[in-house]
């Protein structure tokens, strides 16, 4: 019977060229993680095994950092990855758990723009 | 469930090449990242080369001009293209593969040896 809960960050934005921090959190479960996939919609970005660790998608590995734990920071952002991301936890003996994050990335605020500007 | 089949292991002289393969059956759908790992006696297992469902690879310091990852997606399959091996390259090599939503699943392993 599988008893655990994932925990995640919900939806979030960042600013274009930034970065974010996705976290996935499983509680209430004794279960042993082996396996945590990260993937964005379709594609596949990052797993990390429990003896293998981290290994990051050749795909994405310019713009993808593991951690911190069993999170992943995504860097450089841009609009194109605006989107739902997945925390895939392989556990035994419970099973997989999924979790659920919306990414939103957002041009640079006019705030900002606005003071690299001196008014004359 | 990922079932892995390796082949084209064997024995070479040094210098010369070899083309293993891995092909892939059963829950091989979507997005996936594929690999070779090596592991020597004595040594820990190490990732050699790794290619994305996008075509995009990567490759150890140690094969990187030497060893190239290819992917067949038609196919389910991998092949890793080894020129001017090296006896330090002697091992026995693993296919790994994950695909979209599924745990890590490993081939049974095939021994390339590289003779002086």
């Known amino acids: 019977m599988m008893t655990g809960t994932i925990e995640t960050t919900g939806n979030i934005s960042a600013e274009k060229g930034g970065s974010i921090i996705l976290q996935c959190h499983l509680s209430s479960t004794t279960a042993q993680v082996t396996q945590v996939n990260w993937e964005q919609q379709d594609q596949l970005l990052a797993i990390c095994n429990a003896d293998l660790g981290w290994h990051i998608s050749p795909s994405f590995k310019d713009r993808v950092a593991p951690g911190p734990g069993l999170g992943l920071t995504l860097q450089s952002l841009t609009v194109n990855d605006t989107g739902e991301y997945f925390c895939i936890y392989h556990t035994y003996p419970d099973g997989t758990y999924t979790g659920r994050i919306f990414l939103e990335v957002l041009e640079s605020s006019v705030a900002e723009h606005g003071a690299r500007f001196q008014i004359p | 469930e990922v079932q892995l089949v390796e082949s084209g292991g064997g024995l070479v002289q040094a210098g010369g090449s070899l083309r293993l393969s891995c092909a892939a059956s059963?829950?091989?759908?979507?997005?996936?990242?594929m690999g070779w790992f090596r592991q020597a006696p004595g040594k820990e297992r190490e990732l050699v080369a790794s290619v994305s469902g996008g075509g995009n690879s990567d490759y150890a310091d140690s094969v990187k001009g030497r060893f190239t990852i290819s992917a067949d997606n038609a196919k389910n399959t991998v092949y890793l293209q080894m020129n001017s091996l090296k006896p330090e390259d002697t091992a026995v090599y693993y296919c790994?593969?994950?695909?979209?939503?599924?745990?890590?699943?490993w081939g049974q392993g095939t021994q390339v040896t590289v003779s002086s």
């Open positions: 790994a593969a994950v695909f979209s939503r599924g745990p890590l699943t």
């Open positions: 059963g829950r091989t759908f979507g997005d996936y990242i």
